[in-house]
């Protein structure tokens, strides 16, 4: 009787819709690569399902990966990174859904942070800054920033700005005087990797000073 | 369907240089790594180089390394292979290989390079 | 970096069965997967294994890939054999980035 219900299950699992997704990361512990995939539909029983990595891989054949909650994870060194590997869905040792994917063309950088801004008063501008752990890496160096900034008041009123340096500079005069303004930043490669935004940053919060009625400047903080 | 075709080969001296090419057409070309691989007369297959989809990863076989640069224009859907220095034993038909869904799936016809004097 | 060994030669008559070795050096047979190339002569390799045990599609189920841990070595198995299948034969792994050759073999159908 088990055999049968076994084979239910598995005849059940065959008409479910295993499409899944996945984002690499490089270098994101020292030399470490992560991979971490996902199933697209939040309500796939994941109670037996794997997920397995073959091809392209240094000094094994294939990977398992580790299930924490709905996603599915590796942290290891040995990504080949040249070539297409082969990530399976797996019941036991029947494959549901494979995909072949260069793990270098799903990069998802990690998301910048320390990012500020500074009111320059002589300049009547706002620098803005922030990091990204990339510029130290080997292999994911050149992104493209997405810096976004808002009126706090205007909930998705964003205004964006594409750079690939980790510096911005807001003209005073292009923002609102004496408002709370919201800014935060993500990236995504740009040079040789290819992939998907990284998360935002934590937002950085700055008010713009008064208008300085004689003058017609704005007031410093 | 898929093709590759090398050119560029040709007698040179020891000592010379040369470049090899290969046309690849039929399929998308910056989505695949691309190899160089040899074969002296009468021998056996030689691997020599590869070069990722983006031309960001190159690796050589240590017989060729310093001597030997693969590169890419995806843009023109070209592969290269410039090899210096070249000696009697480099000698070969020279053969760009694709790596799809997994090495060598296709193969051009191969390009002569004869290293004389 | 290690080395792939085959024999130089095997043969085999019209409808029997040959089996092509392929010895490595050093390091597991288990850590890479291992292609299979023929070659006719004059003509360019075409792949008819890849992954220890698949066939490209195009490529008879006559032939067959094998990898047997004891030995450290990988296997290609032709069954039924046809005169068209007289050529030189390729192992290939890699090492990381580095792919590696075996000899070859040269199979004669009698």
């Known amino acids: 009787e088990s055999g049968y219900a076994q084979n239910g299950d598995l005849e059940d699992a065959e008409l479910d819709d295993y499409s899944f997704s996945c984002y690499s990361q490089l270098e994101v512990n020292g030399s470490q690569h992560s991979l971490t995939c996902a199933f697209e539909d939040p309500d796939v029983n994941i109670t037996n399902l794997e997920f397995e990595i073959c091809g392209a891989l240094v000094e094994v054949k294939c990977l398992n990966f580790r299930k924490l909650q709905e996603i599915y994870f590796i942290e290891t060194k040995k990504f080949l990174l040249i070539g297409k590997s082969n990530i399976c869905v797996k019941v036991g040792e029947k494959s549901l859904t494979c995909k072949k994917i260069d793990l270098t063309t799903i990069v998802k950088p990690e998301a910048p942070f320390d990012l500020s801004v500074v009111y320059r008063e002589g300049a009547n501008d706002f620098v803005v800054t922030f990091n990204t752990s990339h510029l130290q890496k080997k292999y994911v160096k050149v992104l493209m920033h997405d810096v976004a900034y808002r009126q706090e008041k205007d909930e998705n009123k964003w205004t964006h700005v594409n750079l690939s340096s980790t510096k911005l500079t807001l003209l005073q005069r292009k923002l609102q005087p004496a408002a709370m303004y919201e800014i935060k930043v993500r990236s995504i490669p740009d040079h040789y990797f290819k992939g998907f935004w990284s998360e935002w940053s934590p937002s950085y919060y700055f008010r713009t000073p008064e208008i300085n009625n004689s003058s017609g400047e704005m007031d410093p903080i | 369907q898929v093709n590759l075709r090398e050119s560029g080969g040709g007698l040179v001296k020891p000592g010379g240089s040369l470049r090899l090419s290969c046309a690849a057409s039929?399929?998308?070309?910056?989505?695949?790594?691309m190899h160089w691989v040899r074969q002296a007369p009468g021998k056996g297959l030689e691997w020599l180089s590869l070069?990722?989809?983006?031309?960001?990863?190159?690796y050589y076989a240590d017989s060729v390394k310093g001597r030997f640069t693969i590169s890419r224009d995806n843009t023109k859907n070209l592969l290269y292979l410039q090899m210096n220095s070249l000696r009697a034993e480099d000698t070969a038909v020279y053969y760009c290989?694709?790596?799809?869904?997994?090495?060598?799936?296709?193969w051009g016809q191969g390009t002569l390079v004869t290293v004389s004097s | 970096n290690f080395m792939l060994t085959q024999p130089h030669s095997v043969s085999g008559s019209p409808g029997k069965t040959v089996t092509i070795s392929c010895t490595r050096s050093?390091?597991?047979?288990?850590?890479?997967?291992v292609q299979w190339y023929q070659q006719r002569p004059g003509n360019s390799p075409t792949t008819v294994i890849y992954e220890d045990d698949q066939r490209p599609s195009g490529v008879p189920d006559r032939f067959s890939g094998s990898i047997d841990s004891s030995s450290n070595s990988a296997s290609l198995t032709i069954s039924g054999l046809v005169t068209e299948d007289e050529a030189d034969y390729y192992c290939?792994?890699?090492?990381?980035?580095?792919?590696?050759f075996g000899g070859g073999t040269k199979l004669t159908v009698l």
């Open positions: 050093s390091g597991s047979i288990d850590s890479s997967y």
């Open positions: 290989a694709r790596q799809g869904d997994y090495m060598g799936d296709y």
């Open positions: 290939q792994s890699y090492d990381f980035h580095h792919l590696v």
């Open positions: 070069v990722g989809w983006d031309g960001f990863f190159t």
């Open positions: 039929g399929f998308t070309f910056d989505d695949s790594v």
